[in-house]
């Protein structure tokens, strides 16, 4: 299976060829397609945990109620159907940290 930070190149043979996530994307592994990082600032929230290539950012409300942290998702790096397509506003700012890179390849 494709490990964290990578995704299958061929949906018909998942886990055979795995490529790294594009910049600004993450995959928890297990043959899941890479998805865009959440931008907490854009959502009007604090970043509780920054994104990496294997996990999304975790956001919390600026005045946190007694609820779980919320996450949002942006569009894919390319218009492909296996990734989310919800549009973001045009003024997002990127995370201040760079992701730790997990090598591509098979797990």
């Amino acid at each position: 299976r494709c490990r964290a930070g990578t995704q299958p190149l061929d949906s018909y043979k998942p886990g055979v060829d795995c490529a790294p996530c594009p910049p600004g994307h993450f995959s928890p592994g297990d043959n899941q397609a890479c998805k865009p990082w959440t931008n907490c600032t854009l959502a009007g929230k604090h970043t509780l945990q920054p994104a990496s290539n294997s996990s999304d950012a975790i956001c919390e409300d600026r005045d946190p109620p007694a609820t779980q942290p919320q996450e949002t998702q942006g569009p894919p790096a390319r218009p492909i159907t296996v990734q989310p397509t919800e549009a973001w506003p045009r003024t997002s700012q990127g995370p201040s940290t760079r992701p730790v890179e997990v090598p591509g390849g098979r797990a």
């Epitope: 995704q7 299958p8 190149l9 061929d10 055979v16 060829d17 795995c18 490529a19 790294p20 594009p22 910049p23 600004g24 994307h25 397609a33 890479c34 865009p36 990082w37 959440t38 931008n39 854009l42 994104a51 942006g74 569009p75 894919p76 790096a77 390319r78 218009p79 492909i80 973001w88 045009r90 997002s92 700012q93 990127g94 995370p95 760079r98 992701p99 890179e101 090598p103 591509g104 390849g105």
Partner: antibody
């Protein structure tokens, strides 16, 4: 049509910095990752890194990570590459290149015309 | 880093010739290989991705094959506009790396 237009040639002193721009048109800039590749005179291609304009997430070649900064301005559909602590070996043509649109493949389907950066004392 | 070694580094051929360029990866890259054409003073152009899939608008005389560590770009009948330098690229892992190039010259 889809087009990437880069800034003009630069001549820099060793130790200084250079910032190259790449203006995109003909597609939704924020939805495609933008990469930078350089080519020294008479040499092959070397990948520098890439950025996803929608959230600013970036991935760098470790050979450049301490000296390069990639940014993107969605309001002007422009990507930037800044390289610091320049040395003579950085003399090259610098290209911006859009990652292609076919699934998860990290190849480059549209390229800028290139920006020549010359580092000389 | 994954090294991509192309051979030959240059070759001379005539219009109508069948030309074969090879690219060898230093480790298994599955089918995660692209090929580009570059003419003097110009930016590279994508020809092939996923080892054998022609990019939009690329003539059928260009074909790619291979998987694992050995890849081939074939031009079935060389045309005047094909005299250029050709590069392979792997994208199974970061950093993305290119071959050293093969210059196809007129005999």
């Amino acid at each position: 049509q889809v087009q990437l237009v880069q800034s003009g040639a630069e001549v820099k002193k060793p130790g200084s910095s250079v910032k190259v721009s790449c203006k995109a048109s003909g597609y939704t800039f924020k939805d495609y990752t933008m990469h930078w590749v350089r080519q020294a005179p008479g040499q092959g291609l070397e990948w520098i890194g890439g950025i996803y304009p929608n959230n600013g997430g970036s991935t760098y070649n470790q050979n450049f990570k301490d000296r390069v900064t990639l940014t993107a301005d969605k309001s002007t559909s422009t990507a930037y590459m800044e390289l610091s602590s320049l040395r003579s070996e950085d003399t090259a043509v610098y290209y911006c290149a859009r990652m292609g649109y076919h699934g998860p493949h990290l190849d480059f389907d549209v390229w800028g015309q290139g920006t020549t950066v010359t580092v000389s004392s | 880093d994954i090294q991509m070694t192309q051979s030959p580094s240059s070759l001379s051929a005539s219009v109508g010739d069948r030309v074969t360029i090879t690219c060898k990866a230093s480790q298994d890259v599955g089918a995660a290989v692209a090929w580009y054409q570059q003419k003097p003073g110009k930016a590279p152009k994508l020809l092939i991705y996923w080892a054998s899939t022609r990019h939009t608008g690329v003539p059928s005389r260009f074909s790619g094959s291979g998987s694992g560590t050995d890849f081939t770009l074939t031009i079935s009948s060389l045309q005047p506009e094909d005299f250029a330098t050709y590069y392979c690229q792997q994208y199974i892992n970061y950093p993305l790396t290119f071959g050293g190039g093969t210059k196809v010259e007129i005999k």
